[in-house]
Amino acid sequence: HNTTVFQGVEGQSLQVSCPYDSMKHWGRRKAWCRQLGEKGPCQRVVSTHNLWLLSFLRRRNGSTAITDDTLGGTLTITLRNLQPHDAGFYQCQSLHGSEADTLRKVLVEVLADPLDHRDAGDLWVPGESESFEDAHVEH
């Protein structure tokens, strides 16, 4: 799996989308988990509704929400009020029994708010991640 980079601004919301094959993953619940390091374990943050037919209903854990378009094959995760500590590796997963298939590996990057003048002299202009030569960046 390549890693897709999603960049958001501190204090704002960031929407992460994970496309998948709706037929292959028919009937499966989905989850969003946080990975501790590039090779670390993935800790569940939030999962879709217990009843697969109700996967379109938004489920929330703290500032993270998840909803699944099971027909269109798109899992959407929203991180509200993005903070520096939200940065890191995540995975979108498709669940079956006690197993989980990775739909997408995601690196969330948190950019300083350009309107926050506390750091005006030290603004970071995002560049291509040195760790992911083939990473796909989405804003």
């Epitope: 390091g37 590039e38 090779k39 670390g40 590796f89 970071w124």
Partner: antibody
């Protein structure tokens, strides 16, 4: 018990090469990145490079590029660091270090260190 | 390469003192900073990862804060076993880089 055990101290002549080993026990090295860090006498820590034993991919600090080779043998759970064209300023303690990589690894294991002395 | 600058390079303190060490990164590194403690003749030990997360088994008197380019390690009440050298290390990009170290000595 999770640990990294390194090979013993070495004394080398300038221009020679040294190969230090680091054997993991209690965990599988494929699940980690293995880094090499050195520390000259009375100095700070200096990162040299890493290997992903799962696929053999390695990355080196520009300062050591071309002079250092990091390898791993998953069958024996051992990583190796070879430094060539040794000079006196390479005299240092060399540590191997295992973690889950960048971006917030919670795992962190270190070897006991191997003293390499370069002297004519 | 990202340069990491620690200050002070050394400090003298007494048992019970509150000690603060700072680390400045030459580029934005978000929260990808670790703090290590090293005692003479020993390998470094991880104290803090991801700028503010306490590693397993590390006493709660240690804390970390900061994001972006400026970070702080605080020891709320210095204990005899805390006299050591402390290093920050950035874990955002390779090559990983360490600060030059801060030696905490007994006053």
């Amino acid at each position: 018990q999770v640990q990294l055990v390194q090979s013993g101290a070495e004394v080398k002549k300038p221009g020679a090469s040294v190969k230090v080993s680091c054997k993991a026990s209690g965990f599988s090295i494929e699940d980690f990145y293995i880094h090499w860090v050195r520390q000259a006498p009375g100095q700070g820590l200096e990162w040299m490079g890493w290997i992903d034993p799962e696929n053999g991919e390695s990355k080196y600090a520009p300062k050591f590029q071309g002079r250092v080779t990091i390898t791993a043998d998953t069958s024996t759970s051992t990583a190796y660091m070879e430094l060539s064209s040794l000079r006196s300023e390479d005299t240092a303690v060399y540590y191997c270090h295992a973690d889950h990589g960048n971006y917030g690894s919670t795992m962190d294991y270190w070897g006991q260190g191997t003293l390499v002395t370069v002297s004519s | 390469d990202i340069q990491m600058t620690q200050s002070p390079s050394s400090l003298s303190a007494s048992v019970g003192d509150r000690v603060t060490i700072t680390c400045h990164a030459s580029q934005h590194i978000n929260v990808w900073l670790s703090w290590y403690q090293q005692k003479p003749g020993k390998a470094p030990k991880l104290l803090i990862y991801k700028a503010s997360n306490l590693h397993t088994g590390v006493p709660s008197r240690f804390s970390g804060s900061g994001s972006g380019t400026d970070f702080t390690l605080t020891i709320s009440s210095l204990q005899p076993e805390d006299f050591a050298t402390y290093y920050c290390q950035q874990g955002q990009t390779y090559p990983r880089t360490f600060g030059q170290g801060t030696k905490v000595e007994i006053k």
